[in-house]
Interface confidence: low
Amino acid sequence: RQQWELQGDRRCQSQLERANLRPCEQHLMQKIQRDEDSYGRDPYSPSQDPYSPSQDPDRRDPYSPSPYDRRGAGSSQHQERCCNELNEFENNQRCMCEALQQIMENQSDRLQGRQQEQQFKRELRNLPQQCGLRAPQRCDLEVESGGRDRY
């Protein structure tokens, strides 16, 4: 990674070091595997919704009343914890991008083939919005041996 020169970059680096992005990686891997399992069906039809509680006992209807608050938007354990971690980057779009890039890097070796890599990348780009957070406008998620185009 490049040298971090600015105060904000140092803060981002320490945020990234503190962050546990593993739940995000697990959530995304589960999601693309679930999507592959349900390939060929309408993923959002009520009887076949891959997110439905009957198919994923960890997942509650994200906007149904919860014991804590009717706004409880719990999805899977991993997504809840992932959103918690990404929330730390909400006010720093560059740092949010760094977090997404780190997730991509960490999982790149586990992705089998170009199609799965593209699917993972697509889900990763959607991740901030699924947590209700702003997504970085420009964020290069290509994993290369050379340096990446920075924010």
Partner: antibody, heavy 129, light 106 residues
Framework: QVQLVQSGAEVRKPGSSVKVSCKAS????????ITWVRQAPGQGLEWMGW????????NYAQKFQGRVTITADESTSTAYMELSSLKSEDTALFYC??????????????????????WGQGTLVTVSS | ETVLTQSPATLSLSPGERATLSCRAS??????LAWYQHKPGQAPRLLIY???NRATGIPARFSGSGSGTDFTLTISSLEPEDSAVYYC????????FGGGTKVEIK
């Protein structure tokens, strides 16, 4: 920039139903809740319910429970609000709006707080015999 | 359900004057309160979210403050185009709007 375009004005008889559409263009549709709000003549704004297209989940205000159905078609980026058993008091302007739904999480449970940042132009529904 | 009470019902001020609109919640909503401007024949417009954050494109003369149960929308120097009804709205409990404050420019 996301825009929401609603269907045109409707006139209905008491006891019938009305279905209003709200088409999104110029941005993501699936991830943000689409909310429906109504304003009766001379009255304030009233939340009716919402849908999150990506999850196909809905929630409705108690006042409208059983009479309102909100649906979404991801393929056309369109949300729909159907209100049944219409009464003359249902004469109102109906708005759809995108909910920016900012999430915050605590003890493993995520919550959202709502602010409607993009609105449709409104659809006037008149219920009259 | 959380009830939002806005005051005053009507505010009649001259251009350049400062407008202070109040919104009181029947129970704490933290900082999760939004303000909207609504003009006749137009869709409502988001001004402020999370109590004090100005929405995109909103002039700096609009500011929000408060937390818990008491919130304020301030228009520092009224312009003729600020004539509208202003609503507060909370999203921590079932979504509710306040009854609105009508701002008239003399």
């Amino acid at each position: 920039q996301v825009q929401l375009v609603q269907s045109g004005a409707e006139v209905r008889k008491p006891g019938s139903s009305v279905k209003v559409s709200c088409k999104a263009s110029g941005g993501t549709f699936s991830n943000n809740p689409i909310t429906w709000v109504r304003q009766a003549p001379g009255q304030g704004l009233e939340w009716m319910g919402w849908i999150i297209p990506i999850f196909n989940t809905t929630n409705y205000a108690q006042k409208f429970q059983g009479r309102v159905t909100i649906t979404a078609d991801e393929s056309t980026s369109t949300a729909y609000m159907e209100l049944s058993s219409l009464k003359s008091e249902d004469t109102a302007l109906f708005y759809c709006a995108r909910d920016r739904a900012h999430a915050y999480c605590n003890n493993g449970v995520c919550y959202t707080t709502d602010a409607f940042d993009v609105w449709g132009q409104g659809t006037l529904v008149t219920v009259s015999s | 359900e959380t009830v939002l009470t806005q005051s005053p019902a009507t505010l009649s001020l001259s251009p350049g004057e400062r407008a202070t609109l109040s919104c009181r919640a029947s129970q704490s909503v933290g900082r999760y309160l939004a303000w909207y401007q609504h003009k006749p024949g137009q869709a409502p417009r988001l001004l402020i979210y999370d109590a004090s954050n100005r929405a995109t494109g909103i002039p700096a003369r609009f500011s929000g403050s408060g937390s818990g149960t008491d919130f304020t929308l301030t228009i520092s120097s009224l312009e003729p185009e600020d004539s509208a009804v202003y609503y507060c709205q909370q999203g921590t409990d079932w979504l509710t709007f306040g009854g609105g404050t009508k701002v008239e420019i003399k």
